[in-house]
Interface confidence: medium
C-alpha cells in the first residue's frame, strides 16, 4: 500500500539526518552541485541537482526517495528553472540546506 506523504517526508528527513551525521570524509568526494531555489518545486529541483552526482553511494537512497516525490521523470543534465543561476555548492552543504528546508515544510504540514 502507498506510504502516507507525512511518513515519506519523515523518512526522507531521517535519511538526510543520517547523511549529515555519518559524514566522515568529504561527502561525494567534495562534488559540487547547482544550488536551487528552495521556495517552490523543491523535490524535483533537488533531484535535478543531485542526479548529476554519480558514483556516490551515500546519496543514492536520497536520490531514489526524491524521485518518489517528483511527479515527472528527471534525467542527468536536465536544466531546472529553479536552480540558482551560476551558483554551485558542495553536496554536503546542499544536503544541510535541504534538510532544514524539508523540516520546515514538515513543520508547516506541507507533505506533498
Amino acid at each position: 500500500s502507498p506510504v502516507p506523504p507525512s511518513t515519506a517526508l519523515k523518512e526522507l528527513i531521517e535519511e538526510l539526518v543520517n547523511i549529515t551525521q555519518n559524514q566522515k570524509a568529504p561527502l561525494c568526494n567534495g562534488s559540487m552541485v547547482w544550488s536551487i531555489n528552495l521556495t517552490a518545486g523543491v523535490y524535483c529541483a533537488a533531484l535535478e541537482s543531485l542526479i548529476n552526482v554519480s558514483g556516490c553511494s551515500a546519496i543514492e537512497k536520497t536520490q531514489r526517495m526524491l524521485n518518489g516525490f517528483c511527479p515527472h521523470k528527471v534525467s542527468a543534465g536536465q536544466f531546472s528553472s529553479l536552480r540558482v543561476r551560476d551558483t554551485k555548492i558542495e553536496v554536503a552543504q546542499f544536503v544541510k540546506d535541504l534538510l532544514v528546508h524539508l523540516k520546515k515544510l514538515f513543520r508547516e504540514g506541507q507533505f506533498n
Partner: antibody, heavy 122, light 108 residues
Framework: QMQLVESGGGVVQPGRSLRLSCAAS????????MHWVRQAPGKGLEWVAV????????HYADSVKGRFTITRDNSKNTLNLQMNSLRAEDTAVYYC???????????????WGQGTMVTVSS | SYVLTQPPSVSVAPGQTARITCGGN??????VHWYQQKPGQAPLLVIY???DRPDRIPERFSGSNSGNTATLTISRVEAGDEADYYC???????????FGGGTKLTVL
C-alpha cells in the same frame, strides 16, 4: 535596543478578567509573529498563544482556548492578551515573546520580555 | 498533542561535558530549539533549528537531533552554565508550540 516590556499583571479573583499588554521597541514589530508564554511558580515553561505578523491567524494552548484572546496593534507596536474566566491554575509569570515567522509556523523565540506576574486567588 | 520528555536533572563536574536529552516521537523530523533559564531571569535561546547557535552563545553549546532524541551538549561546563534547560518544537498537527518539561543542570 530591541525590547519587550509587559504590563497589566496583578492579583485577581477566580472568574474575573485581566488584560496584559506588551510594548515592543527597537525592531520591525509588524514583521514578527508574537507569542505569550507563561511559567507557574516553580514550574516549567508553557506556551499560551501566538498571533501572526499581520494578525490574520491566532492559535492557543488547549488549556486557555475559549478563555484567552491574543490581539496586536501594529500601528502602536503593542501585543495584548485578554484573559477571561481566570482560574487558580492560570497563576504564573507571563512572558511576551518574539519569533520570526516561516509562512504559518513559528521559528525559535529570539527575544523575551522580563515577564509580568498574574496571581489568581480569592 | 506532541509530547517532549526531558530528564528532570543532570549533574556534571566543572570542565566535563553535559548532555541533556529531549525525547519525542520521530523528533528527528522536527526542528528543535533549546533555551537556558537562570533563576529570576527570562529564558535565553541557546540553540535553534537543531544545531545553530545565536550570536553571543559560546561554541561550547551544540545540538544534535535524530530518531527519537534531540540532544543539547555543553562541553567544558562552567559554574555559570547552571540553569534550567528547555527544548521546544512547533507541532503542525495542533498548530501549537510545545516545550519539554525542563532539565535542571547542576554543576558539582
Amino acid at each position: 535596543q530591541m525590547q519587550l516590556v509587559e504590563s497589566g499583571g496583578g492579583v485577581v479573583q477566580p472568574g474575573r478578567s485581566l488584560r496584559l499588554s506588551c510594548a515592543a521597541s527597537g525592531f520591525a514589530f509588524r514583521t514578527y509573529g508574537m507569542h505569550w508564554v507563561r511559567q507557574a511558580p516553580g514550574k516549567g515553561l508553557e506556551w499560551v498563544a501566538v498571533i501572526w505578523d499581520d494578525g490574520s491567524n491566532t492559535h492557543y494552548a488547549d488549556s486557555v482556548k475559549g478563555r484567552f484572546t491574543i490581539t496586536r496593534d501594529n500601528s502602536k507596536n503593542t501585543l495584548n492578551l485578554q484573559m477571561n474566566s481566570l482560574r487558580a491554575e492560570d497563576t504564573a509569570v507571563y512572558y511576551c515573546v518574539r519569533a520570526p515567522q516561516w509562512y504559518l509556523t513559528a521559528e525559535a523565540f529570539d527575544l523575551w520580555g522580563q515577564g509580568t506576574m498574574v496571581t489568581v486567588s480569592s | 498533542s506532541y509530547v517532549l520528555t526531558q530528564p528532570p536533572s543532570v549533574s556534571v563536574a566543572p570542565g566535563q561535558t553535559a548532555r541533556i536529552t529531549c525525547g519525542g516521537n520521530m523528533i528527528g523530523a522536527y526542528l528543535v530549539h533549546w533555551y537556558q533559564q537562570k533563576p529570576g531571569q527570562a529564558p535565553l535561546l541557546v540553540i535553534y533549528d537543531d544545531v545553530d547557535r545565536p550570536d553571543r552563545i559560546p561554541e561550547r553549546f551544540s545540538g544534535s537531533n535524530s530518531g527519537n532524541t534531540a540532544t543539547l551538549t555543553i562541553s567544558r561546563v562552567e559554574a555559570g552554565d547552571e540553569a534550567d534547560y528547555y527544548c521546544q518544537v512547533w507541532d503542525h498537527n495542533t498548530q501549537q508550540m510545545v516545550f519539554g518539561g525542563g532539565t535542571k543542570l547542576t554543576v558539582l
